[in-house]
Every structure is written in C-alpha cells, then in structure tokens.
C-alpha cells in the first residue's frame, strides 16, 4: 500500500495505525494516500518540523497516549485537508503559537489529558472552521479574554477537569453556535452575570463539581435552548427565584450534592420538558405545596439523603407523569393521606431509611401502577388493612428492618404477605420485633395464638423477584440497576466510561432506574 512502515499496519481504506513502545519517532515513509493516521501508545516524545509533509490528503490524525511533550511550530505544515486532530493523553505543557496555522479544514481538535498550563488567543486564531475543542484534563488556571473569539463556528467546548478559579464574563461572548459547554471539575466559586449570555444555542452546560456558592439570578436567561444543566456537587445554598425561569427546553437538571436548605416557590419553571430532577444530598427540610407544579413532564425526582421531615399534602401537585420518586434517607415521620394522590403514573417509590411509624390506609389509593415500594428501615409496627390490595403490578416490596408488632392485629398483613411472598424478595424478610417472645421470627410464618379472622385477599400472580423494565435503553441514557443498588460514583451521560460499577449498598438511592448527573 504505497510503502507501509514496518511498525505500522495499513489498510486498503487508506488507514494507517502505528502502535507500540518501540516507536520513538514518526515512522517513515508513510503512504502518500493515507487519509487516517493513528499513532498510539508509543514512546514518541517530540514532533519535529513537517513529519507529515508527504501525506497532504490526511483527514484524521490521532497522536494519543504517547510521551509527547514538545512540538515544533511547523509540525502540521501541509495538512490543509485535516479535519480531525487529536493530541489527547500526552504530556504537553506548552503549545507553540502557530502550531495550527494552515489547518484551514480542521473541525475537531482534541488536546485533552495533557499538562497544558495556559492557552492564548493566538493559539486558535487560525482555526475558524473548528467545531469541537477538547481541553479537559489539563492544568489551566484561567482562560484569557479573546481565547475563543475566532471560533465562531464552535459547537462543543470542553474545559472540564482543569484548575479554573474564575471565568471572565467575556470569554464565551462570540460562541453563538456553541451547543455544549463543559466546565465540570474545576475550582470555580462564582460565575459572573452575563457569562453565558452569548450562548443562544447552548444545549448542555456542565458546571458540576466546582465550588460555586451563588448563582446570579439571570445567569441562564439567554439560554433558551438549554436541555441539560448540571450543577451537582457545588456549594449552592440557595437558588434565586428566577434563576431557571427562561429554560423551556430543559429536560435534565442535577442539583445533588449542594447545600440547599429550601426550594423557593416557583423555582422550577415553567419547564414543560424537564424529565429528571436530581436533588439528593442537600439539606432540604420540608417540601411546600406546588414546589414542582410546573414540571408536568417530570419522570424522575430524586430527593433522597436530605433532612425532609415535612411534606405538604400538595407538594407533588402537577407531577402526573412521574415514574420514580426517591424520598429515602430523610427524617419523615408522617405522611398526609393525600400526599401521593396526584402521582397516577408512579411506578417506583423509595421511602426506606426514614422514621415512618405508620402509613395512611389510602396513601397509595391513586397510584395503581406501582411496581416497587421500598419501606425498609422505618419505624413501622403494622400497616393498614388493604393498603396494597389494588396494586396489581406490584412486584417488589421491601418491608424488612421495621419493628413489626406481631400481635393479633398483624394477621391481615401476615396473611397478605403469605400470598405475596415473591414480591418481598428472598434476601431479607420482615421479622417481628415485639412481643419479646417472638422477636426475630419471620413475620410471614409467625404463629399468632389468636383465631385468624377471615381476611379476603385477592389472589395475585407470581411476580418475578426483580422487576423487569421492557424497552429500557442502555447506558448512557438510562442505567437500569436493581432497586437496592447505586452507581458508586455519579457520572454524567457524556462520560467515556464503558462500564459502571454497581454496589449492593442498601443505604443509598433505592431506585430502579438510577443514574446521576
């Protein structure tokens, strides 16, 4: 194939791949008709002047996972057709000015996972056709004004995993075509008003894992096309009342891992397209009426690991499409009989790790499609007669770690459980706490020395131990994990992870479709 170097493999499709630790310089001679060149996992430490001079038809060049620490300014001369250039996962600390000069066709530039300390406006001033710029995983401490001013066609900019402590309000002002901006895992403490005003086409904004304490009230007011907003793992203690007011396209909002104590009235909305709202690991103590009432399409609401002790009976008004509600690991002692009345489409509810002492008999009256209920580790001594009778789709019910009182009043529940054992799972069964003579015995097989009253319990089919959700898309859109598991570390849906570790930790989400932002 027009002379393939011995260290490389060349395919008919004009693709050349050179890999291996024995390679210490760009192999020669490279086939003149090469359109794609990959130099991976080598010991190349520098790129000298014009090593690619004779392969001017090259469209894609990947020089990744090498020891590359120095590049001569003319290294990419004569690559006018190059559309994709990756220098990711090397050891670059400095980019020479003019390095990308002449790369008039360049659309994607990947400089991620290096050791870059700074970028300057002159670095990218020639890259007027650039659509994607990846700078994440470097050591950048600031971005100078003008750095991206010439990149008017840019649609994707990743500055995550750097050391940015502040952002100038002017740095993104010319990026009117930007659709994705990632600033996650930096050290930002605040973002000046106006920073995102020019980003009228922005669809995704990732600000998670910074140290942001306050959001300016109008910070997102120009971002009407925003669909995904990640604000998790910051230091946000309150949300200005109007901060999310102009986001009609938003479908995912993550706020978990902040210091929110309350949710301002009207804070969420109108957001007719929001599907997921992640609020776990905050300090929320109560939920007033109508706090989510603008979120008519919300399907996943995660409120676990807060300090919620009171839920107003109208707190979930408007959530007619909600499928998953996580309230576990809070301080709930009481639930008003009307609190879940609006949740007609709810499938999964997790209430474990609270202090519930009893449940209203009609608490699930309108929620006929429930498939999974987590009630373990509360203070329940009994449950009202018939509380689950109408739940024909219920296939997962967790009742263990409650102080069940096994007197004659427990018989209706015991009889129902006998007929519905498959729903309880086999891992842990509910056991009696009192009276003392039966403590520790299984509630299901307990012998209560009282005449068993006649209890009509409808026959139910045998359900699988773990619910099955048909047509569940695979990660990254949704991660299906058992209701007693959690992802060990929250991941955004754009990460490059190919596997997700799952741990059997019952103290966490308790969701059947758990994925964090």
């Amino acid at each position: 194939y027009h002379g393939c170097p011995s260290e490389c493999t060349c395919s008919r499709a004009s693709q050349v791949e050179c890999t291996g630790a024995r390679i210490v310089a760009v192999p020669t001679p490279l086939p003149w008709n090469a359109m794609s060149l990959q130099i991976l996992n080598t010991h190349i430490t520098e790129l000298n002047e014009s090593p690619f001079l004779n392969i001017s038809a090259l469209i894609a060049l990947r020089i990744e996972k090498n020891e590359l620490s120095r590049i001569t300014p003319g290294a990419f001369r004569n690559l006018g057709s190059l559309r994709y250039l990756s220098l990711a996962n090397n050891k670059l600390q400095v980019l020479p000015i003019g390095l990308f000069q002449g790369l008039d066709s360049l659309e994607s530039l990947l400089l991620s996972s290096n050791q870059l300390l700074q970028i300057q406006p002159a670095h990218f001033s020639q890259c007027s056709n650039l659509k994607e710029l990846q700078l994440h995983g470097n050591h950048l401490e600031y971005i100078p004004d003008g750095a991206f001013d010439h990149l008017v066609g840019l649609t994707k900019l990743n500055l995550g995993k750097n050391s940015l402590t502040h952002i100038s309000p002017r740095v993104f002002q010319h990026l009117g075509n930007l659709q994705v901006l990632r600033l996650y895992e930096n050290r930002l403490t605040d973002i000046p008003m106006g920073t995102f005003d020019g980003l009228v086409n922005l669809q995704e904004l990732a600000l998670q894992q910074n140290q942001i304490g306050l959001l300016s009230p109008g910070l997102f007011h120009n971002n009407h096309n925003l669909q995904r907003l990640y604000l998790s793992n910051n230091h946000i203690s309150q949300l200005p009342p109007s901060v999310f007011m102009q986001l009609p396209q938003l479908n995912r909002l993550t706020l978990f891992g902040n210091s929110l104590k309350e949710l301002s009235p009207g804070i969420f909305g109108p957001m007719p397209n929001l599907r997921e709202l992640w609020l776990y690991d905050n300090h929320i103590s109560s939920l007033p009426d109508n706090v989510f009432s603008n979120l008519r399409q919300l399907q996943v609401l995660i409120l676990s690991r807060n300090q919620i002790s009171f839920i107003s009976p109208g707190a979930f008004n408007g959530l007619t499409e909600l499928r998953e509600l996580s309230l576990h690991t809070n301080a709930l002692q009481d639930l008003d009989g009307n609190v879940f009345r609006m949740l007609a489409n709810l499938q999964n509810i997790s209430l474990q790790n609270n202090r519930l002492r009893q449940l209203p008999g009609n608490i699930f009256a309108n929620v006929n499609g429930l498939m999974a209920i987590q009630l373990q580790n509360n203070q329940l001594e009994n449950l009202p007669l018939g509380i689950f009778d109408h739940l024909g789709k219920l296939c997962e019910l967790r009742l263990y770690d409650n102080p069940w009182r096994c007197d004659s009043d427990i018989l209706p529940l015991r009889n129902w459980l006998l007929l519905n054992q498959p729903r309880l799972g086999t891992d842990t069964v509910p056991v009696c706490f009192s009276p003392a003579n039966v403590r520790g015995q299984s509630l299901i097989i307990i012998n209560v020395n009282v005449a068993v009253p006649s209890v009509h319990v409808p026959e139910v089919p045998s359900y699988p131990e773990t619910p099955w959700y048909p047509d569940t898309p695979s990660y990254p859109d949704t991660t299906s994990v058992s209701s007693t598991t959690e992802l060990t570390s929250p991941v955004e849906d754009y990460t490059d992870l190919t596997t997700i570790q799952v741990t059997d930790d019952r103290s966490v989400w308790g969701m059947t479709q758990a994925q964090s932002g």
Epitope: G266, D289, S293, N338, P360
Partner: antibody, heavy 118, light 107 residues
Framework: QVQLVQSGAEVKKPGASVKVSCKAS????????INWVRQAPGQRLEWMGW????????KYSQKFQGRVTITRDTSASTAYMELSSLRSEDTAVYYC???????????WGQGTLVTVSS | DIQMTQSPSSLSASVGDRVTITCKAS??????VAWYQQKPGKAPKLLIY???YRSSGVPSRFSGSGSGTDFTLTISSLQPEDFATYYC?????????FGGGTKVEIK
C-alpha cells in the same frame, strides 16, 4: 362527609388553662393533619399549630410555643388544643381545621369561643 | 414571618358590581395562597386555593389570580349572599399567615 365538631364555649380567668376538643368524623382520623387556628375579636386569623393524629407529632407557631399543647385521642377520633397562662388577649374563637389536597383549610370546625376575663 | 397585607380593609358595593380585593405577601410565596369567605358567627369557607383554583361548589363569579407576592380575588358580579369578610392566606412556609381581611358591605 368530613365533619369537625368542637366543644362548647369556655370562660376562663387570666393565668388559667383551657382545653378545646375537636371530634372528627367522615374520614380516617389518623391519616390527615389537623390544625388549630384562632380569631380574636376584630383581628386576623392566626395559625397556631398542627398535629398528625397517627403519630402524635406536632408543629407549633413560634408565637404560641411553650403555651400551646396539641394532643389527640385516636380511639375517640378527637384532637385537643390546650392553651395555658391565659391572658385577656387570648379571648378568641378557636377553630380546628383539616387540610384538603394542599395545606389550605378545606374543612373547619364550627369554632369555640374562649373568653378570658377576671 | 411572612406578612400578608390585604387591601382595602373594607369596601361598599352594590349587587352586580365587580369587586377586586388584593393581597401582597412580604416575600415570594409562589402560588401557595388561598382565599376564604367568612360570615358573622361562622367558620371561614374556602373559596380559592393555589392562587387561582376554585374550591368545589364555589360559584364561577369568584376567581383568583397572581403569583409570587401579588394576588387578587375578583367577584365578577356581586350577589346578595357575597356580603361578608374575605381573607387571604399564605401556606408556603410556617407559620402560615392570613391577611387582615376585607369587609364587603352593601352600599
């Protein structure tokens, strides 16, 4: 239908205590919060606190904290509001009220007039 | 505590008149406002909840509007049985508080 029936009028001396009852019917008493609201002559309505009859948990307005005690007897489906250290300005009609589908007062008792006079 | 300031404190009107009562909250309460009607010697009666939703059995001449801090109760065509005192209430945060009332009298 939901009904809340309160005890009759009371006349008390300053420093004394009064206990007003509210008997609920037409629904499961233990499943819904019951509130107490008062109205002094010519004054606005004032929320005093609530009880969740199922557990006995209470929440009181800071203004009445330490002087008001709300209790319940689940076997009698009755909630009680006791106000101590009565003063003349505690002269008011005291209402029990139950929330509906939100934290607004859909159902009210008929009211109990408490007069504090020496 | 959130203050609910109601105005006017009283008004005189005739049957068939359009009557508007306003209520201003000292801080944002979203739509968590209710309106009640009270007649002498009687308990209050719920008219409007969530700022604009009519309670069951309430005539359509009663309507509510507003959000945040400013709320309005409107009676489109006053009827003889509407002469009473009207109260607004916020139930967004504890302690729940009421307005001072508006007495609607016959002109």
């Amino acid at each position: 239908q939901v009904q809340l029936v309160q005890s009759g009028a009371e006349v008390k001396k300053p420093g004394a205590s009064v206990k007003v009852s509210c008997k609920a019917s037409g629904y499961t008493f233990t499943d819904y919060y019951i509130n107490w609201v008062r109205q002094a002559p010519g004054q606005r309505l004032e929320w005093m606190g609530w009880i969740y009859p199922g557990s006995g948990n209470t929440k009181y307005s800071q203004k009445f904290q330490g002087r008001v005690t709300i209790t319940r007897d689940t076997s009698a489906s009755t909630a009680y509001m006791e106000l101590s250290s009565l003063r003349s300005e505690d002269t008011a009609v005291y209402y029990c009220a139950r929330w509906g589908y939100g934290a607004y007062f859909t159902y009210w008792g008929q009211g109990t007039l408490v007069t504090v006079s020496s | 505590d959130i203050q609910m300031t109601q105005s006017p404190s009283s008004l005189s009107a005739s049957v068939g008149d359009r009557v508007t009562i306003t209520c201003k909250a000292s801080q944002n309460v979203g739509i968590n406002v209710a309106w009640y009607q009270q007649k002498p010697g009687k308990a209050p009666k719920l008219l409007i909840y969530s700022a604009s939703y009519r309670s069951s059995g309430v005539p359509s001449r009663f309507s509510g509007s507003g959000s945040g801090t400013d709320f309005t109760l409107t009676i489109s065509s006053l009827q003889p049985e509407d002469f009473a005192t009207y109260y607004c209430q916020q139930y967004n945060s504890f302690p729940y508080t009421f307005g001072g009332g508006t007495k609607v009298e016959i002109k």
